[in-house]
């Protein structure tokens, strides 16, 4: 029944003070997406993207979360506390829910620059 698959940006790292895009993509299903929920590691909701009502960013994250691109989410002004798991949950008819996981590591600026310099292309 649930034929779809969720592809995510996987494990990502970003600089403290910078921004990062969290992206999930649902493929290989005829199902219709009615809502996408974005949750943080402690299960608190960051945002909901509803097919009819559009985006709702939860008050605690209003200053630092921007909707998009697409069904994704942009986290801004990153702090070390933002390190952890993020989940996208796709509500689809008639398949049900699909869930994707992203792990974000926020690095001190100097560390991020150092690790980026030595990344294998």
């Amino acid at each position: 029944m649930m034929t779809g698959t969720i592809e995510t940006t996987g494990n990502i790292s970003a600089k403290k003070g910078g921004s990062v895009i969290l992206q999930c993509h649902l493929s290989s299903t005829m199902a219709q997406v009615t809502q996408v929920n974005w949750e943080q590691h402690d299960h608190s909701l960051l945002a909901i993207r509803n097919a009819e009502l559009g985006w709702h960013i939860y008050p605690a994250f209003k200053d630092r979360v921007a909707p998009g691109p697409g069904l994704g989410l942009t986290l801004q002004s990153l702090t070390m506390n933002d390190t952890g798991e993020y989940f996208c949950t796709y509500h689809t008819y008639p398949d049900g829910t699909y869930r994707g996981r992203i792990f974000l590591e926020v690095l001190e600026s100097s560390v991020a620059e150092h690790s980026a310099r030595f990344q294998i292309p």
Epitope: T34, N37, A51, E52, H91, Y93, G96
Partner: antibody, heavy 122, light 106 residues
Framework: QVQLVQSGSELKKPGASVKVSCKAS????????MNWVRQAPGQGLEWMGW????????TYAQGFTGRFVFSLDTSVSTAYLQISSLKAEDTAVYYC???????????????WGQGTLVTVSS | DIQLTQSPSFLSASVGDRVTITCRAS??????LAWYQQKPGKAPKLLIY???TLQSGVPSRFSGSGSGTEFTLTISSLQPEDFATYYC????????FGGGTKVEIK
């Protein structure tokens, strides 16, 4: 208000085709999946399948493949059911029904058309 | 396909009676169950979704319960306008309906 209005009753001869329309109003048509349900005289409800109103992709339930076609015209917020090579056993009321709710916990057919009676008789 | 079995198929009752209709699923469907009311010549009307959530505008004498494979629709005090046929529907997989329960005047 949110409603689905279907085309009127049809009397057809065996072998003919029929196209039933279902016009939506009061909501964003492409935000909610659309279903088709058949009810033969004196019988229960039978799910025929559904159409993704975003992509136009139809899915047909067992027993409703081949002669049955679901389609859309999103410019006029209308879903269509076409039945070809009609048989006497296709005589029934056909309903369109919207899937309401946004999260899976809330899914249900919350808005129905008034139904279209298709009678197949020689 | 998930089969739904409703019981009873027919039910005779009087105004003011408490009425209970059962719906059994052939496999677990969590709480993905809805109940509909249909009157002759009319389209079905949604009463309850998610097994126990009352649809907006539906009188509070209607209630639903259950999860997994066994569900019930209860009408606490039957009113004249409640004589109709009731259907359960599962939405855990491709939707299917129960066979219906006709509530008649005794």
């Amino acid at each position: 208000q949110v409603q689905l209005v279907q085309s009127g009753s049809e009397l057809k001869k065996p072998g003919a085709s029929v196209k039933v329309s279902c016009k939506a109003s009061g909501y964003t048509f492409t935000s909610y999946p659309m279903n088709w349900v058949r009810q033969a005289p004196g019988q229960g409800l039978e799910w025929m399948g559904w159409i993704n109103t975003n992509t136009g992709n139809p899915t047909y339930a067992q027993g409703f493949t081949g002669r049955f076609v679901f389609s859309l015209d999103t410019s006029v917020s209308t879903a269509y059911l076409q039945i070809s090579s009609l048989k006497a056993e296709d005589t029934a009321v056909y309903y369109c029904a919207r899937v309401g709710g946004y999260s899976v916990d809330e899914y249900a057919f919350d808005v129905w058309g008034q139904g279209t009676l298709v009678t197949v008789s020689s | 396909d998930i089969q739904l079995t409703q019981s009873p198929s027919f039910l005779s009752a009087s105004v003011g009676d408490r009425v209970t209709i059962t719906c059994r699923a052939s496999q677990g469907i969590s709480s993905y169950l809805a109940w509909y009311q249909q009157k002759p010549g009319k389209a079905p009307k949604l009463l309850i979704y998610a097994a126990s959530t009352l649809q907006s505008g539906v009188p509070s004498r209607f209630s639903g319960s259950g999860s997994g494979t066994e569900f019930t629709l209860t009408i606490s005090s039957l009113q004249p306008e409640d004589f109709a046929t009731y259907y359960c529907q599962q939405l855990s997989s491709y939707p299917t309906f129960g066979g219906g329960t006709k509530v008649e005047i005794k």
